[in-house]
């Protein structure tokens, strides 16, 4: 059995899935800001777990997903006060009783050292410095991201 | 109805210790971040610390860290703030608000506690 | 450390008389800026939050305006009530900091 907050990541992914496909993101739009092949919006308000997936979704966007250790550092050097939390895409899955990325895939526990409880209704939020688990009722600021698409140059053959 | 009772006020002498208890109820605890404001007699207000709704990040004041822990049981829907190595100068009345995260503002107070530094 | 410097520290005003309140910030703040009010023995009540949203339950004749470091609470016609002192705060960054306070006295 899913919890809420699971049917809602997969239904947002699923509506995602069924969109037509896009022209490749070659820049940010006008108030993102670029993170390497990403572009990241920190949101202003705040907002519950679920509320935010939905907000990113509305943008054409995700929450936020770290790949690895490197990615989180460089994030969390744009976050400008070690009072503010900001919630990513990553929740804890009651049914496989582990963290769980919006994307479906598991955490990999090398990745992030989080501070507090993997249970139900467990989400992740980052701030400057740390990784944490918080109630996903609690709301916090969210991080969207939209992928960059890599300029690959062109090789022509010889003439 | 959302309600903040604090307790643990008194008279405690310089280099002493006391804990404050800040109960709430009438709202999902666990979901807010929470703080300590003080007010030292016919003064302004001074934010003294803060704390994470599941408990695991903390934040202080410069003029209590070192000195002051901020906790909570969410169990017990219950704040805390230890206060060790008293000085005169943290005579005042301690309220506990909801809110903490930034931007949050306070939205509720309690009705504060006393505390008197003095020999 | 994000200093807040209110104008004037008291005033004297009659009911009906219409108050303006300014808060100052040392550097910008953005709308990051909240007023409470609170009268003798009790505890400072949240007024408005984020410059200028009403908090919930707070008459309409309180409002307020501003951005980036000058902020403004408007007591539209003055209130036996609203005889307090009235705090500005800024949520910014941290330390959290308030300003001196206003003691709105009746003329």
């Known amino acids: 059995q899913k919890s809420s907050i699971e049917k809602c990541s997969v239904d947002i992914q699923q509506s995602r899935n069924k969109t037509t496909e896009r022209p490749g993101l070659l820049n940010c739009p006008i108030y993102w800001q670029q993170l390497r092949e990403k572009c990241l919006l920190f949101s202003h308000t705040v907002n519950p777990w679920n509320n935010s997936l939905a907000d990113c979704s509305t943008k054409e966007s995700s929450l936020l997903l770290i790949r690895d250790k490197d990615e989180l550092i460089h994030t969390q050097n744009l976050i400008r006060d070690k009072a503010i939390l900001f919630w990513i895409g990553l929740n804890f899955s009651l049914s496989e009783k582990n963290w769980k990325w919006i994307n479906g895939s598991f955490l990999n526990s090398n990745d992030l050292e989080i501070r507090g409880d993997a249970k139900e209704n467990s989400c992740i939020s980052i701030s400057q410095t740390s990784v944490y688990s918080e109630y996903c009722s609690t709301e916090i600021r969210w991080i969207c991201q939209k992928e960059l698409t890599p300029v690959r140059n062109k090789v022509y053959p010889d003439s | 109805e959302v309600q903040l009772v604090e307790s643990g006020g008194g008279l405690v002498q310089p280099g002493g210790s006391l804990r404050l208890s800040c109960a709430a109820s009438?709202?999902?605890?666990?979901?807010?971040?929470m703080s300590w404001v003080r007010q030292a007699p016919g003064k302004g207000l001074e934010w003294v610390s803060a704390i994470s709704g599941s408990g695991g990040s903390t934040y202080y004041a410069d003029s209590v860290k070192g000195r002051f822990t901020i906790s909570r049981d969410n169990s017990k829907n219950t704040l805390y703030l230890q206060m060790n190595s008293l000085r005169a100068e943290d005579t005042a009345v301690y309220y506990c608000a909801r809110g903490g995260y930034l931007p949050d503002a306070f939205d509720y107070w309690g009705q504060g506690t006393l505390v008197t530094v003095s020999s | 450390d994000i200093q807040m410097t209110q104008s004037p520290s008291s005033l004297s005003a009659s009911v009906g008389d219409r108050v303006t309140i300014t808060c100052r910030a040392s550097?910008?703040?953005?709308?990051?800026l909240n007023w409470y009010q609170q009268k003798p023995g009790k505890a400072p009540k949240l007024l408005i939050y984020?410059?200028?949203s009403l908090q919930s339950g707070v008459p309409s004749r309180f409002s307020g305006s501003g951005s980036g470091t000058d902020f403004t609470l408007t007591i539209s016609s003055l209130q036996p009530e609203d005889f307090a002192t009235y705090y500005c705060q800024q949520t910014y960054s941290t330390p959290l900091t308030f300003g001196q306070g206003t003691k709105v006295e009746i003329k």
């Open positions: 550097q910008s703040i953005s709308s990051y």
């Open positions: 009438g709202f999902t605890f666990s979901s807010y971040a």
């Open positions: 984020a410059a200028s």
